[in-house]
């Protein structure tokens, strides 16, 4: 059976930073941030688009020693990310997978709201251990917060664009990207 | 632990404008939305509007728009609700309100009392 | 704006007796609500949230339930403390509305 929970959550961190930072760049901030819920996240095959596959180890002492992620639709428009648990974990005789999908929706005050949905693909008859749901969505908690507190005290970083000055561009001041950024300081 | 402490009372002449502050404490202040809330003598309770800490962005009622503004101190861990063109129906208790992440309220400060009157 | 129904407004019970408010809501708002306590003087304290959840350090004696449209706030068994005036809270996506309150007093 499928089995679906719901849930929404907020942060006073702006969708699109958020987004960059918790989503696209998770794997490496995770054990960054929270070193006691993942050890290390590493890519087995993919660029990180859809059909890249992660291993995500967690820390000694936490009930399951690894899970692996299968990318879905990342949509940087619309701020989406769609993934699917398909081994380690709770994934086993009862569970053939959890497809999550997040969307990072922008509120008028410059914050985010985050839409979550877990869909649990059970085996036959099985129903979803609901312990198992709970610490699925603590863990989540527990990453989302530590990405948020990282970014608040870390004002510059993950930011969409950059202000550059006159003098370093020659011109008017305007707004460019980290990339354009990057660019511009290496010519 | 969390703490919420708001300015004393304030009296007011209709028409007049009026700024009540709410000190945090025990959490970091820019992670959480704060809210005003407020109570006519005898009646329920009234939303307001917000704050996001972090950004300074505002999101009112819309009942207020126009007439309200929110602002914040993240140095001092302070937010403030200024209410202009006051009205004897602005008597009120003005509460600021910690969101949790959910959107409920998880922390509330003690009150501010504003009277108008002539 | 999501309009919230609170009934009874007043209600008079006795230390003992089991206590049911409820709140309606215009519109779903799926599980997002909370149920607070405030007496006089003093700001609501948060009982309640998520429709079913109860806060950390409040008695067991209360407990939630209903999603949707329909909501209960029911105390078991009333104590001496439990006088006060009782608000329902919808906070569905990115609005927030009161009901208008119960007043719990003395039969």
């Known amino acids: 059976g499928v089995f679906n929970y719901e849930t929404e959550t907020t942060s006073v961190i702006p969708a699109a930073r958020l987004f960059k930072a918790f989503i696209l760049d998770g794997d490496n901030l995770f054990p960054k941030v929270a070193p006691q819920a993942i050890s290390s996240v590493e890519n087995i095959e993919g660029n990180g688009g859809p059909g890249t596959i992660k291993k995500i180890s967690f820390p000694e002492g936490l009930p399951f020693k690894y899970v692996k992620d299968r990318v879905d639709e990342v949509d940087h428009t619309n701020f989406k990310y769609n993934y699917a648990v398909i081994e380690g974990g709770p994934i086993g005789d009862t569970l053939e997978k959890i497809s999550n999908e997040i969307k990072i929706v922008a509120t008028p005050d410059g914050g985010s709201i985050l839409k979550i949905s877990n869909k649990y693909h059970t085996k036959g008859d099985h129903e979803v251990k609901a312990e198992q749901v709970k610490a699925s969505k603590e863990m989540g908690e527990t990453l989302l917060r530590a990405v948020e507190s990282y970014l608040l005290a870390h004002s510059d970083a993950y930011n969409e664009q950059k202000l550059i000055s006159e003098e370093d561009l020659g011109g008017e001041q305007k707004l460019i990207s980290e990339e354009d950024l990057h660019h511009h300081h290496h010519h | 632990q969390v703490q919420l402490v708001q300015s004393g009372a304030e009296v007011r002449k209709p028409g007049a404008s009026v700024k009540v502050s709410c000190k945090a404490s025990g959490y970091t202040f820019t992670g959480y939305y704060l809210h005003w809330v407020r109570q006519a003598p005898g009646q329920g309770l009234e939303w307001m509007g917000l704050?996001?800490?972090?950004?300074?962005?505002?999101n009112f009622a819309q009942k207020f728009q126009g007439r309200v503004t929110m602002t914040r101190d993240s140095s001092i861990s302070a937010a403030y609700m200024e209410l202009s063109r006051l009205r004897s129906d602005d008597t009120a208790v003005y509460y600021c309100?910690?969101?949790?992440?959910?959107?409920?309220?998880?922390?509330w400060g003690q009150g501010t009392l504003v009277t108008v009157s002539s | 704006d999501i309009q919230m129904t609170q009934s009874p407004s007043t209600l008079s019970a006795s230390v003992g007796d089991r206590v049911t408010i409820t709140c309606r809501a215009s519109?779903?708002?799926?599980?997002?609500l909370a149920w607070y306590q405030q007496k006089p003087g003093k700001a609501p304290k948060l009982l309640i949230q998520e429709a079913s959840s109860i806060e950390s350090g409040v008695p067991s004696r209360f407990s939630g339930s209903g999603s949707g449209t329909e909501f209960t706030l029911i105390v078991s068994s009333l104590q001496p403390d439990d006088f006060a005036t009782y608000y329902c809270q919808q906070y569905n996506s990115y609005s927030w509305t009161f009901g208008h309150g119960t007043k719990v007093e003395i039969k």
């Open positions: 309100a910690r969101q949790h992440w959910n959107r409920y309220f998880d922390n």
């Open positions: 519109q779903s708002v799926g599980n997002w």
């Open positions: 704050i996001n800490p972090n950004t300074g962005g505002t």
